[in-house]
């Protein structure tokens, strides 16, 4: 990895061992200076593998609300608007980091947690399982 | 929102104002107890809107490595394996939280940051703009 010289103005840290506890400023900085401002807002409906978004809420997590995609069909929508079962709709998943209150119900103490979320769906050619 | 009683065993916190600084344990807990264990590993190639994954590395960010999807084509792959430009490949984007070292180069002090990443691509019917 790349070694970066430590800034002498860093806050003091007692324990250098893992599991390490760090200070995090929750005042979120939004870096979404996206060159393509159009977001995936209507793709869920226009996709050949359409999906619905479900709200997943957990007050012990930060962010407390996460939207989960569920593919509408096992097949994909063809040019006629019908479901074509020769193709498969599959979820596109991503591991994301969230903060989990630890100990529970604590407003200022968290643990980093990795969760798998489904962001949308895509249409794929099926895997053909050949029987010997 | 849901109000949860504060746990009396919480670490003490000086400043209750935003921007609030919290303690975060970086020993990641992995909650991926997924009922559908098959992950999106080969979907990027099998999709009718295939994509390539590009490594985005930033040592001032946690996680330092993020993979970004870029759609291979403007159109979608049809049943013959050719690109059909009557359909559009579009990126599915998601806002995720990362930790940004602040002040820079500090190992134990971060600020929460929201970034937009492309996770994969999906094939959509184009929006037809009618000229008046």
């Amino acid at each position: 990895g790349i070694t970066i010289p430590r800034n002498p103005g860093c806050p003091n840290s007692e324990d250098k061992n893992f599991p390490r506890t760090v200070m995090v400023n929750l005042n979120i900085h939004n870096r979404n200076t996206n060159t393509n401002p159009k977001r995936s807002s209507d793709y869920y409906n226009r996709s050949t593998s359409p999906w619905n978004l479900h709200r997943n809420e957990d007050p012990e997590r930060y962010p407390s609300v996460i939207w989960e995609a569920k593919c509408r069909h096992l097949g994909c929508i063809n040019a006629d608007g019908n479901v074509d079962y020769h193709m498969n709709s599959v979820p596109i998943q991503q591991e994301i980091l969230v903060l989990r209150r630890e100990p529970p119900h604590c407003p200022n103490s968290f643990r980093l947690e990795k969760i798998l979320v489904s962001v949308g769906c895509t249409c794929v050619t099926p895997i053909v399982h050949h029987v010997a | 929102g849901i109000t949860i009683p504060r746990n009396p065993g919480c670490p003490n916190s000086e400043d209750k104002n935003f921007p609030r600084t919290v303690m975060v344990n970086l020993n990641i807990h992995n909650r991926n107890t997924n009922t559908n264990p098959k992950r999106s590993s080969d979907y990027y190639n099998r999709s009718t809107s295939p994509w390539n994954l590009h490594r985005n590395e930033d040592p001032e960010r946690y996680p330092s490595v993020i993979w970004e999807a870029k759609c291979r084509h403007l159109g979608c792959i049809n049943a013959d394996g050719n690109v059909d430009y009557h359909m559009n490949s579009v990126p599915i984007q998601q806002e995720i939280l990362v930790l940004r070292r602040e002040p820079p180069h500090c190992p134990n002090s971060f600020r929460l940051e929201k970034i937009l990443v492309s996770v994969g691509c999906t094939c959509v019917t184009p929006i037809v703009h009618h000229v008046a």
């Epitope: 709200r55 498969n88 099926p126 053909v128 | 997924n34």
Partner: antibody
Framework: QVQLQESGPGLVKPSETLSLTCTVS????????VSWIRQPPGKGLEWIGI???????DYNSAFKSRVTISVDTSKNQFSLKLSSVTAADTAVYYC??????????????????WGQGTLVTVSS | DIVMTQSPLSLPVTPGEPASISCKSS????????????LAWYLQKPGQSPQLLIY???TRQSGVPDRFSGSGSGTDFTLKISRVEAEDVGVYYC?????????FGQGTKVEIK
Amino acid sequence: QVQLQESGPGLVKPSETLSLTCTVSGFSLPSHSVSWIRQPPGKGLEWIGIIWNNGGTDYNSAFKSRVTISVDTSKNQFSLKLSSVTAADTAVYYCARNFYITDYYYENYFMDAWGQGTLVTVSS
Amino acid sequence: DIVMTQSPLSLPVTPGEPASISCKSSQSLLFSENQKNYLAWYLQKPGQSPQLLIYWTSTRQSGVPDRFSGSGSGTDFTLKISRVEAEDVGVYYCQQSYYTPYTFGQGTKVEIK
């Protein structure tokens, strides 16, 4: 607990529109999808269509041209409208909640809670 | 549309004895991406609405007694009751949730001998 209750006129004249309401309680509308199913007297079950949590719909193509399913979230109510009815539409009509499974990334089309059903007779 | 064919259509049973119902689909219900079979079983007791017993061929819905079990793959499926009880009488339906429209079998009436 989860409850679904169908209501509407028990008698509809041929060529008219059958209108039913399904009032639900005990679960969150934004999470769950609801299907309508019917059962002609002495016969089996027939899926009519579904309304997803976002208000989108999918219908059995056998009914597509004459069916509409909608939701009024403020009243916790779903509705079914079936136009141009004939005697063949005489049936017990059920609304049912589609099973929601966390950490499973497809909509489900099996139903884990059903209303008690309402009999609709089409006759002049 | 996918045709679901159940047999037998009528099944007289003796309490304490096993019972078995067959369901055949006109197309495979196995989804290659997750190896799940999209078949569910319901029981409609006399005068009641259907209740979900089993989904994904063999997963019992919560609260369903373990005397009920499901098996099969592709196009051939079976519901077994290891020891029939009086409360198990009614009409059993299989349903495929793979292809739209989502279709049911014609039902198997289970009654006490």
